[in-house]
């Protein structure tokens, strides 16, 4: 058992042209909230139960009212983490959907209304117990920045939260058949037995003998479904509901996909993933040949000259599925290394590399100073993926090719005159001042503010600054 945690950092307009209009207005103030849905595995083809790993809704964010004429800023966010408890092992690979919802708070009859602002999705690998992973996803003109992690709930440990640990009862060794829990060598693996009769589908335990219920179930053995709270009431036409959730038929109940197709839910409807030889909304069209043009999105059809022989679609980059019907979010596989930004251009994948890295996948770490000569005795200094030259005295510029004017910065104080010199600069001080930069006044009695003038120099002499 454990918890998947999601921290939303910002939601606002993405970079580039076409900034979205603010979702709120003075007439219709609104606030945001988020929903996360998790499924195990990386495969888009998997016909898992919807949100089989779990789902969570955030709290509502602060109320926001657009300032007239102002561009949409990053919008105020709800406090806290979204937490999705998982009862069994953490799968290590998972798919996510994060939805940004808007709750309008205008004076509609019947209270606030919900609408979906943006939805992002991806597939990731993640070990439980690891550090926070940061991510940026774009949906249209919106950009969502977030971090996530999976952590085990005691007594579970390990990258999959499958091993259970308990403090040792004996100081020397664990009980029969039970191993030490590395790295917690002072703890032992322990069996965990829930309360007798605890529902295996709707209950779980974190301590022996207990029975804790999953959301939607109650009772001592988690066998009683919780009825949803009332959320519809007759308030007159066009009442906007408060966004309550009501139980209903499963979107894929009875599997509407024919011919062995697998069904997955979408918010309004469902989607069928069809086996080879079938296509259509419900995989109902069969006997397909290449002459029927079954390959979408520019896929190349091979074989299938007659209805009894199978055809194969060779999909162009960016598409997959037996009929090339699915767009691949290739960036979700994080192909760009060393923090490079992934751009899926449809026809190709591009990595925009951070400074100091190069290559198709930003895999090459550049030696910043390789082949970069600094002129006039300057030395090359590497740093942060860029090179710079530390120039010898009297030279400046990116490659030390420019002769520096040491007097350009007017270094002589109190009206002193500056002279360039082969070894630096010289200040000729105005009467009454002395020092390398003419910074010290000479006292009227002839004594200077310095403890003693350097030998061989009288006040008023030009001072050479080395």
């Amino acid at each position: 058992a454990g918890v998947f945690e999601l921290q939303i950092h910002s939601f606002g307009p993405g970079p580039g042209p076409g900034a979205p209009r603010s979702p709120c207005s003075a007439r219709l103030p609104c606030r945001l909230f988020f929903r996360v849905c998790l499924k195990p595995g990386l495969s888009e083809e998997a016909a898992e139960s919807p949100c089989a790993l779990g789902a969570a809704l955030s709290a509502r964010g602060p109320v926001y009212t657009e300032q007239p004429g102002a561009p949409a800023p990053d919008l105020p966010l709800p406090d806290g983490l979204l937490q999705v408890p998982f009862r069994d092992a953490w799968p290590g690979t998972f798919s996510f959907i994060i939805e940004t919802w808007r709750e309008e708070l205008g004076d509609q009859i019947g209270g606030p209304a919900w609408s979906l602002l943006a939805r992002v999705a991806g597939r990731r690998r993640l070990a439980a117990g690891g550090p926070w992973a940061r991510d940026i996803q774009r949906a249209g003109a919106w950009e969502l920045r977030f971090s996530y992690r999976a952590r085990c709930e005691p007594p579970a440990v390990g990258t999959a939260c499958t091993r259970l640990c308990r403090p040792r009862s004996a100081p020397s060794r664990c009980g029969p058949g039970l191993r030490p829990c590395a790295p917690l060598e002072d703890e032992c693996e322990a069996p965990l037995v829930c309360r007798a009769g605890c529902s295996p589908e709707h209950g779980f335990c974190e301590q022996p003998g207990e029975c804790r219920c999953l959301e939607g179930w109650t009772g001592p053995l988690c066998t009683v479904p919780v009825s949803t709270s009332s959320c519809l009431s007759p308030r007159g036409p066009s009442s906007a509901t408060t966004g309550c959730l009501v139980p209903g038929p499963g979107p894929c109940d009875g599997n509407p996909c024919a011919n062995g197709g697998s069904c997955s839910e979408t918010p309004r409807s469902f989607e069928c993933t069809c086996p080879r030889g079938f296509y259509g909304l419900r995989c109902e069209v069969s006997g397909v040949t290449c002459a029927d043009g079954p390959c979408f999105n520019g896929g190349l059809c091979v074989g299938g000259a007659d209805p009894d022989s199978a055809y194969i679609c060779h999909c162009p980059p960016g598409f997959q599925g037996s009929n090339c019907e699915k767009r691949v979010d290739r960036c979700s596989l994080q192909p760009c290394r060393n923090g490079g930004l992934c751009l899926d251009l449809g026809h190709a994948l591009r990595c925009r590399c951070r400074a100091g890295f190069a290559g198709p996948r930003c895999e090459h770490d550049l030696d910043d100073c390789a082949g970069r000569a600094c002129a006039n005795g300057g030395t090359c200094v590497e740093g942060g993926g860029a090179h710079r030259c530390s120039c010898a005295l009297g030279f400046g510029g990116r490659d030390c090719r420019e002769r520096a004017d040491p007097c350009a910065a007017r270094p002589c104080a109190h009206g002193g005159r500056c002279y360039a010199h082969f070894s630096g600069l010289v200040c000729a001080c105005a009467p009454g001042y002395m020092g390398a930069r003419c910074e010290f006044p000479v006292h009227p009695d002839g004594a200077s503010a310095l403890p003693a003038a350097p030998p061989g120099l009288r006040p008023g002499d030009p001072q050479r600054y080395l």
Epitope: L232, T241, L245, P247
Partner: nanobody, 126 residues
Framework: EVQLVESGGGLVQPGGSLRLSCAAS????????IGWVRRAPGKGEELVAR????????RYADSVKGRFTISADTSKNTAYLQMNSLRAEDTAVYYC???????????????????SGQGTLVTVSS
């Protein structure tokens, strides 16, 4: 402005039929999924039928399967619920609403409702 207005409710004997209508304005029903939700006295809400006119997708709760039929006329921007073989346990206020599949939890599928109408009362009694 989004509006949903239900009609067609009334008193009917067990075994009888009714046809409920849901007239929509302010949006195009062909682009949304419309559901009929009912609330019986002392019970929680239940989504009994859904339709997505774009692809003809329909779904029914087990309690009404084979007896209720949901349909839509996109030219009239109206959804319908044909209720046959009515039983006493079908007595409820029926609302139409824009509905979106939200999540699955502990054996239940849950739907978020966007806008709903004012409801129409269906009473099945002898």
């Amino acid at each position: 402005e989004v509006q949903l207005v239900e009609s067609g409710g009334g008193l009917v004997q067990p075994g009888g039929s009714l046809r409920l209508s849901c007239a929509a304005s302010g949006f195009n029903i062909s682009e949304e999924s419309i559901g009929w939700v009912r609330r019986a006295p002392g019970k929680g809400e239940e989504l009994v039928a859904r339709i997505y006119p774009t692809n003809g997708y329909t779904r029914y709760a087990d309690s009404v399967k084979g007896r209720f039929t949901i349909s839509a006329d996109t030219s009239k921007n109206t959804a319908y619920l044909q209720m046959n073989s009515l039983r006493a346990e079908d007595t409820a206020v029926y609302y139409c609403a824009r509905s979106y599949y939200a999540h699955y939890s502990a054996g239940y599928y849950y739907y978020a409702l966007d806008y709903s109408g004012q409801g129409t009362l269906v009473t099945v009694s002898s």
